[in-house]
């Protein structure tokens, strides 16, 4: 990963010198490549059963896998997760706010992994090797340029990808009504590898 | 902001001691509060005129304002931006890839700012003071709890907010066909402050 933090990129471009500081390609690629990045996640998306309650804050900062891989058959997925427990304010209607503990899954280590069966039927396998391995398909381009593309944000939010071969997440725990730690329905995370979006569980 | 980076949260929760390290409320709040956070942004969303070309990587890491404010009438918006120029590979159909320089806008400083005219007609202004100022509206809760909520991710992606009083962005530059940097039509950014989503330009 690049040595220059993004905070410095912001300031380097307009420093008044005639030679604008250009972030070199390898560094741009490195920062866009598959990794765990801090992301704000809606509490209720992680705890859908709590939809009738309100939390403050209503979103929490978690590390989630995101970024590009070098091939459209590869997707950025978590290969190691860990639980983190946070204290939030819960508002029960008509009652004063009170603290609760909620446990979330964080992505600790990310890798580019194959999603089996992703090869399009109209693209013969022996033809794929000729395509650039760092580009995504775009309909307006000729066949040669529609083979393998490492990363496409556009439209990825709504696309549903097949399950990636990702180790099943550490099951998340949350307080059950009976007081014992209750295992959430394991999210056999049909990871939607957000090719440059966030890898979030499909529900 | 909290001293503990999120990377450490991931590892602290399972340390085997009976006293699990729970991230305290003020720290959780601090990390969810309005700030500039690194985010992967689709190149073509920033350069829509380049939709017929392909870039590698197709997304770049930029600092963008995101997070919660203490009131649903406040939104996390950039109050200072700066340009950053990056080197990417551009693929023109039938041609070999070549480096180009693209300039992007980063959010340097974020603030919670009022979005005028956001008060719902069914919520009288004099009633608002009684409501918790750190909670978002949820239909299932009584009126008292639907007044002011600092942060709601859910649905925010599709909601269109009025323009925030944000300084106009530094116009972005990108290489023109003639090789000289060509000024993009300035994006009088109707900022969509993504209450816990990313503040991204509306187009």
């Amino acid at each position: 990963l690049p040595a220059v933090p993004p905070q410095q990129w912001a300031l380097s471009a307009g420093n008044g010198s005639s030679e604008v500081e250009v972030v070199p390609f390898q560094e741009v690629w490195g920062r866009s490549y598959c990794r765990a990045l801090e992301r704000l996640v809606d509490v209720v998306s992680e705890y859908p059963s709590e939809v009738e309650h309100m939390f403050s804050p209503s979103c929490v900062s978690l590390l989630r896998c995101t970024g590009c891989c070098g091939d459209e058959n590869l997707h950025c997925v978590p290969v190691e997760t860990a639980n983190v427990t946070m204290q939030l304010l819960k508002i029960r209607s008509g009652d004063r706010p009170s603290y609760v503990e909620l446990t979330f899954s964080q992505h600790v280590r990310c890798e580019c992994r194959h999603s089996p069966g992703r090869q399009s039927p109209d693209m013969p396998g022996d033809f794929r090797a000729d395509a650039p391995s760092f580009l995504p398909p775009r309909r307006s381009l000729p066949m040669l340029f529609r083979m393998e593309w490492g990363c496409a944000l556009t439209g990825s939010q709504s696309a549903v990808w097949p399950s990636s071969p990702v180790p099943e997440e550490i099951p998340r725990m949350h307080p059950g009504r009976n007081g014992k730690k209750q295992q959430r329905k394991p999210l056999r995370e049909k990871m939607k590898p957000e090719r440059c979006g966030d890898a979030v569980p499909r529900r | 902001l909290p001293a503990v980076p999120p990377q450490q949260w991931a590892l602290s929760a399972g340390n085997g001691s009976s006293e699990v390290e729970v991230v305290p409320f003020q720290e959780v709040w601090g990390r969810s509060y309005c700030r500039a956070l690194e985010r992967l942004v689709d190149v073509v969303s920033e350069y829509p005129s380049e939709v017929e070309h392909m870039f590698s990587p197709s997304c770049v890491s930029l600092l963008r304002c995101t997070g919660c404010c203490g009131d649903e009438n406040l939104h996390c918006v950039p109050v200072e931006t700066a340009n950053v120029t990056m080197q990417l590979l551009k693929i023109r159909s039938g041609d070999r890839p070549s480096y180009v320089e693209l300039t992007f806008s980063q959010h340097v400083r974020c603030e919670c700012r009022h979005s005028p005219g956001r008060q719902s007609p069914d919520m009288p202004g004099d009633f608002r003071a009684d409501a918790p100022s750190f909670l978002p509206p949820r239909r299932s809760l009584p009126m008292l709890f639907r007044m002011e909520w600092g942060c709601a991710l859910t649905g925010s992606q599709s909601a269109v907010w009025p323009s925030s009083p944000v300084p106009e962005e530094i116009p972005r530059m990108h290489p023109g066909r003639n090789g000289k940097k060509q000024q993009r039509k300035p994006l009088r950014e109707k900022m969509k402050p993504e209450r816990c989503g990313d503040a991204v330009p509306r187009r």
């Epitope: 004063r96 009170s98 603290y99 307080p175 059950g176 730690k181 | 006293e19 203490g70």
Partner: antibody
Framework: QVQLQQSGAELVKPGASVKISCKAS????????INWVKLAPGQGLEWIGW????????KYNEKFKGKATLTIDTSSSTAYMQLSSLTSEDTAVYFC?????????WGQGTLLTVSS | DIVLTQSPDSLAVSLGERVTMNCKSS????????????LAWYQQKPGQSPKLLIY???TRESGVPDRFTGSGSGTDFTLTISSVQAEDVAVYYC????????FGSGTKLEIK
Amino acid sequence: QVQLQQSGAELVKPGASVKISCKASGYTFTDYYINWVKLAPGQGLEWIGWIYPGSGNTKYNEKFKGKATLTIDTSSSTAYMQLSSLTSEDTAVYFCVRDSPFFDYWGQGTLLTVSS
Amino acid sequence: DIVLTQSPDSLAVSLGERVTMNCKSSQSLLNSGMRKSFLAWYQQKPGQSPKLLIYWASTRESGVPDRFTGSGSGTDFTLTISSVQAEDVAVYYCKQSYHLFTFGSGTKLEIK
């Protein structure tokens, strides 16, 4: 209605241990923190620690680490505080209290007297 | 650790009088984003358990008479009883919950 019923007064010898109980009723036990507070004669209130029955997680005031141990039994909706290596300094009324960040329901208190 | 200093230690007033007591924190208890101060006031009558009066520095707990008012923000807080009644004889504690919990030393209210 919400109630926290604490065990009765205790007279114990120095060096011994004692376990005070707090039985909760009238609400879902696992949804709210249980805190423990000390009120020593002629002193003010001191927070000892909390336990979150939904997870069993605990947090202690540094001053009471090694002195107090908080546990729960969710099947009986009961919280416990064990105090060890007792000295005269531990003579006090101990309260269990529901909720955080604001303590809304208090037990009636358990008087612990440490004397030889 | 956050230290809360209450003043005065004790005060004696006549029935119907207005009384104020103070609580000063060694650091700000204000969560500026929420615009809430994590401070509460408790009343402990002789031989009883403490009772929550005020939270968020100024929000009155349900059932608490409106003669009790909390004010202040950040580091300086005040509890005011507009017209003291005989049943208000008690020790009043402030408590911070910004970082864990600490109580002030208490202010003892007596009737002259």
